[in-house]
Interface confidence: low
Amino acid sequence: MMTGTIETTGNISAEKGGSIILQCHLSSTTAQVTQVNWEQQDQLLAICNADLGWHISPSFKDRVAPGPGLGLTLQSLTVNDTGEYFCIYHTYPDGTYTGRIFLEVLESSVAEHGARFQIP
């Protein structure tokens, strides 16, 4: 039975040209995390593998940095980066947990962070 929950940074916004940290945290389970995938729609951004470490997809190498922790840092943001981002935790023996973050990249200098929320 899957008992864990994913806590994410929720709905967030950032300025064009700036950086943002996407973070998820898996709690309430003793399951072993095998791998964490970071995805945007159907595109794979990065992977943190328990054995092999971090791998950034070649097409994002210039703008994506691993960490902090299991999080992901997006750099040189453009308006096209607006959208849904998913952290996918592959665990043993629970299975897969998925967290969702919505990022809005703003032209203006007004960029506020949304509240944190949990996805069961």
């Epitope: 095998t34 995938n37 794979l44 992977i47 092999l52 791998h55 997809s57 592959h90 043993y92 023996p93």
Partner: antibody
Framework: EVQLVETGGGLIQPGRSLRLSCAAS????????MHWVRQAPGKGLEWVAV????????YYADSVKGRFTISRDNSKNTLYLQMNSLRAEDTAVYYC??????????????WGQGTTVTVSS | QSALTQPRSASGNPGQRVTISCSGS????????VNWYQQIPGTAPKLLIY???QRPSGVPDRFSGSQSGTSASLTISGLQSEDEAEYFC???????????LGGGTQLAVL
């Protein structure tokens, strides 16, 4: 529809080379690790090799190490297996299979129908 | 000689419960979840159970998996004639960096 189609099998003499291809469709090929698995006539499954989503991580079974090379072309949605110095014991049906994870083995959730390689003089 | 050990064959009557075992070592099954594959003669293998006990969509719930220490088992409850096939266990070996497969168990529905 998610599909894998293997080609390139055939009858080949011992010591010669052969390249198998696996064409993927219906999914984002560049986001998944891919495997080759073979099955000799009347025998069980034998894992051959795996390659990560971007092609930078590769692992091989001891029985093929140094002779076989797994590679991929994500722009063509195609997986390859270059087989050199072929032996009679390499005779088998060769399957390509998708791994649900991009980098590391998790299972093989989609399989092709296989291509037959016969090594004989 | 397979690194994972399975019985060569198993059998059962329709409606019965059948369990197929798979034993490994600390470098594979002690560290990683087992997957099970079903292969009907003349067809490609099919993923049956992954991550020890998860079923892909379309796999009936009469198939279940369990794992403890260095051994695992596949249980088919309510055996049906279409379950007649060969079943393979598989696990990634973290030490050797290879995928290890059991020798396969041929299941006969009597």
């Amino acid at each position: 529809e998610v599909q894998l189609v293997e080609t390139g099998g055939g009858l080949i003499q011992p010591g010669r080379s052969l390249r198998l291809s696996c064409a993927a469709s219906g999914f984002t090929f560049s986001s998944y690790a891919m495997h080759w698995v073979r099955q000799a006539p009347g025998k069980g499954l034998e894992w051959v090799a795996v390659i990560s989503y971007a092609g930078e991580v590769k692992y091989y079974a001891d029985s093929v190490k140094g002779r076989f090379t797994i590679s991929r072309d994500n722009s063509k949605n195609t997986l390859y297996l270059q087989m050199n110095s072929l032996r009679a014991e390499d005779t088998a049906v060769y399957y390509c299979a998708r791994d649900p994870l991009p980098l590391h083995y998790y299972g093989m959730d989609v399989w092709g129908q296989g291509t037959t390689v016969t090594v004989s003089s | 000689q397979s690194a994972l050990t399975q019985p060569r064959s198993a059998s059962g009557n329709p409606g019965q419960r059948v369990t197929i075992s798979c034993s490994g070592s600390s470098s594979n099954m002690g560290r990683r979840p087992v997957n099970w594959y079903q292969q009907i003669p003349g067809t490609a293998p099919k993923l049956l159970i992954y991550s020890q006990n998860q079923r892909p969509s379309g796999v009936p719930d009469r198939f279940s998996g369990s794992q403890s220490g260095t051994s695992a088992s596949l249980t088919i409850s309510g055996l049906q004639s279409e379950d007649e096939a060969e079943y393979f266990c598989a696990v990634w070996d973290d030490i050797g960096r290879v995928l290890q497969l059991g020798g396969g168990t041929q299941l006969a529905v009597l």
